[in-house]
């Protein structure tokens, strides 16, 4: 798997999309996990609804939300209020039994807010030991939430 790079601005929301073949992964729940080191395990952050037919409902763990278009074949992860510590390597996974297939390897990069004048570097990336081989950059269009806007509306 090549690594796809998604860049977001600190304090804003970043949307990561992971396309997959809807028929090949029929009936499978999905997960978003964080890679702990280059050879380390992938630590589950959030997974889709326990009932697969309800995978379109947004599930959330802290500032990370996940939703799955099981028919169209797109898993979407939203990282809200992006922070420097969110930078790193992640995976979108398709779960079956105790196994997990990697749908996409993702590198999240956090850019400094251009309106923030703190004396800081403009890019947070993982440690130099982590591989950037075959990385494909995909800029994510994101925006700040409007005042009073509910980022993740409650699902009925």
């Amino acid at each position: 798997h090549n690594t796809t790079v998604f860049q977001g601005v600190e304090g804003q929301s970043l949307q990561v999309s992971c396309p997959y073949d809807s028929m090949k992964h029929w009936g499978r729940r999905k997960a978003w996990c964080r890679q702990l080191g280059e050879k380390g395990p992938c630590q589950r952050v959030v997974s889709t609804h326990n009932l697969w037919l309800l995978s379109f409902l947004r599930r959330r763990n802290g500032s990370t939300a996940i939703t799955d278009d099981t028919l169209g074949g797109t898993l979407t992860i939203t990282l809200r209020n992006l922070q420097p510590h969110d930078a790193g390597f992640y995976q979108c996974q398709s779960l079956h039994g105790s196994e997990a297939d990697t749908l996409r390897k993702v590198l999240v990069e956090v850019l400094a807010d251009p309106l923030d004048h703190r004396d800081a570097g403009d890019l947070w990336v993982p440690g130099e030991s982590e591989s950037f081989e075959d990385a494909h950059v995909e800029h994510s269009i994101s925006r700040s939430l409007l005042e009073g806007e509910i980022p993740f509306p409650p699902t009925s």
Epitope: K24, G27, L54
Partner: antibody
């Protein structure tokens, strides 16, 4: 027992639309996706699309994109398939078919609805 | 789209015969293959899913095998009610597609 009962045969003129219904019983309607498959006279099977009965989300085969609309009414456990701008090549038996979550195969089928398009 | 080619397109057999129908996919579909039986004027009936799993209620004389691009449906001892048309269906890649069918006739 699981049953999918479809509406009766239809005769339509070219350019018209047809709406076929599929009433489910014997299982929880919102627990399974519903698909539509058609079969022209003496021909093979052709997948048209699928609907999630909970969300109403749909995916259609490219061939039918823009002409087919799949909907559902969960209150009466019924799925619908509407095909517009009919042409003679659309003459076929239309089947609704249930899809379990463990495999993308069609485990129960409706009895079929013959749609004849003729001027 | 993936093309599914069944062979033969028709065959004649007698009750008690062992019958084999093959299905070839135009590209690798792993084991994402199903088999159906259809009788005239009736809806198809699911026999086998995931290449070799027998659908509930289907007689054990039906079996499926294969992986990748080549698959087989076997009827170990043909019964009078087995005379029908058989279709394979792949669902390893969207959109799902069917073979053209194999008609099993009485010899």
């Amino acid at each position: 027992q699981v049953q999918l009962v479809q509406s009766g045969a239809e005769v339509k003129k070219p350019g018209a639309s047809v709406k076929v219904s599929c009433k489910a019983s014997g299982y929880t309607f919102t627990g399974y996706h519903m698909s539509w498959v058609r079969q022209a006279p003496g021909q093979g099977l052709e997948w048209m699309g699928v609907i999630n009965p909970v969300s109403g989300n749909t995916v259609y085969a490219q061939k039918f994109q823009g002409r087919v609309t799949m909907t559902r009414d969960t209150s009466i456990s019924t799925a619908y398939m509407e095909l517009s701008r009919l042409r003679s090549e659309d003459t076929a038996v239309y089947y609704c078919a249930r899809i379990p979550s463990y495999t993308y195969a069609f485990d129960y089928w409706g009895q079929g609805t013959l749609v004849t398009v003729s001027s | 789209d993936i093309q599914m080619t069944q062979s033969p397109s028709s065959l004649s057999a007698s009750v008690g015969d062992r019958v084999t129908i093959t299905c070839r996919a135009s590209q690798d579909i792993s084991n994402y293959l199903a088999w159906y039986q259809q009788k005239p004027g009736k809806a198809p009936k699911l026999l086998i899913y995931r290449a070799s799993s027998l659908q509930s209620g289907v007689p054990s004389r039906f079996s499926g095998s294969g992986s990748g691009t080549d698959f087989t449906l076997t009827i170990s001892s043909l019964q009078p009610e087995d005379f029908a048309t058989y279709y394979c269906q792949q669902h390893g890649h969207s959109p799902t597609t069917f073979g053209q069918g194999t008609k099993v006739e009485i010899k």
